[in-house]
């Protein structure tokens, strides 16, 4: 089992949309695949895929999950808020026929505030 995640770095504006993609490949067929997205180490969602369908379509705040055969798991954040910023990791495990797991590399998401003055205020608020 191998997992490739992208992009490595994603910078978007608050209120727009962010798309994170995870490519899951296995040399042999699988009956059930458990997938998981985490943000800064905390689990956002942990659905499974069987018969070509996800058991859950929601993944964290404003997150939508989709599976496109043969291998693409997509997490779409829409609309993006400032607290979506963080480090996202995709993990996958074949549960049936036999356990095998792998995870992707980190995607770092940076969300820029919609109001540029908000950005200036934030920067100015850091101690001297």
């Amino acid at each position: 089992l191998s997992v490739q995640q992208g992009p490595n770095l994603l910078q978007v504006r608050q209120g727009s949309q962010a798309t994170l993609v995870c490519q899951v490949d296995q040399a042999t067929a699988w009956e059930r695949l458990r997938v998981k997205w985490t943000k800064d180490g905390a689990i956002l969602c942990q659905p499974y895929i069987t018969n070509g369908s996800l058991s859950l379509g929601v993944c964290g705040p404003q997150g939508r999950l989709s599976w496109q055969a043969p291998s693409h798991l997509t997490l779409q954040l829409d609309p993006v808020s400032l607290n979506h910023s963080g480090a996202y990791v995709c993990w996958a495990a074949v549960e049936i026929p036999e356990l095998e797991e792998a995870e992707g590399n980190i995607t770092r998401l940076f969300v820029d505030p919609d109001d540029p003055t908000q950005n200036r205020n934030r920067i100015a608020s850091f101690p001297g």
């Epitope: 191998s2 296995q26 040399a27 042999t28 699988w30 895929i49 291998s71």
Partner: antibody
């Protein structure tokens, strides 16, 4: 590009252990998503998958041979090896090593093969 | 184990004519999860190791002449050579990778009539 080369004795006595090594060049056997297999071709041309070792060192064997087979690796030499115990004349075959990836699940690179005869 | 049954055992076809080789699996090789058939076709010439032609039942490997094509789904698959060339004389094998153990068909010997 990746190349595979089998080596080992061409003649093994019945009841002994057949030992072969596959040396891989141009690619690391520890690369994520890759599997390193042994396949044999019997004199009648029949192809038989023996088993594989994957990038993490995990193995999978053909149940028909499982009790007699061990596949191991030496990452420092970029080699993987086959041991087949208690051989009989039925194990006489051309033994090949080959690689396969998760993403493209086919044997895309093969060694040239080495003939092993089991005879006293 | 999944049994792969190839037919015919041997085939003689005139140059420029169509050659058709069949492969039947003892269980379906199609996965609804990935929308793929886990079936490959190989060509083996005398003294050489097998060479991949077709993967996922119908995807031709880059560099393989377009006279080679694969079709079928589930349990029944076909390799077709649309116009036989002299260099196509070889043994042809189907192989599944739906699960372990991976198994091959017994091969079809293709000759020129």
């Amino acid at each position: 590009q990746v190349q595979l080369q089998e080596s080992g004795p061409g003649l093994v006595k019945p009841s002994q252990t057949l030992s072969l090594t596959c040396t891989v060049s141009g690619f690391s056997i520890s690369t994520s998503g890759y599997y390193w297999s042994w396949i044999r071709q019997h004199p009648g041309k029949r192809l038989e998958w023996i088993g594989y070792i994957n990038y993490g060192g995990g193995t999978s064997y053909n149940p028909s041979l499982k009790s007699r087979v061990t596949i191991s690796r030496d990452t420092s030499k970029n080699q993987f090896s086959l041991k087949l115990s208690s051989v009989t004349a039925a194990d006489t075959a051309v033994y090949c090593c080959a690689t396969m990836a998760d993403r493209f699940a086919f044997f895309d690179v093969w060694g040239q093969g080495t003939m092993v005869t089991v005879s006293s | 184990d999944i049994v792969m049954t190839q037919s015919p055992d041997s085939l003689a076809v005139s140059l420029g004519e169509r050659a058709t080789i069949n492969c039947k699996s003892s269980q379906s090789l199609f996965s609804s999860n990935t929308n793929r058939n886990y079936l490959n076709w190989y060509q083996q010439k005398p003294g050489q190791s097998p060479k991949l032609l077709i993967y996922h039942a119908s995807t031709r490997l880059s560099g393989v002449p377009d006279r080679f094509s694969g079709s079928g789904s589930g349990t029944d698959f076909t390799l077709t050579i649309s116009s036989l060339q002299a260099e196509d004389v070889a043994d042809y094998y189907c192989q599944h990778h739906y699960e372990t153990p991976l198994t091959f068909g017994d091969g079809t010997k293709l000759e020129i009539k």
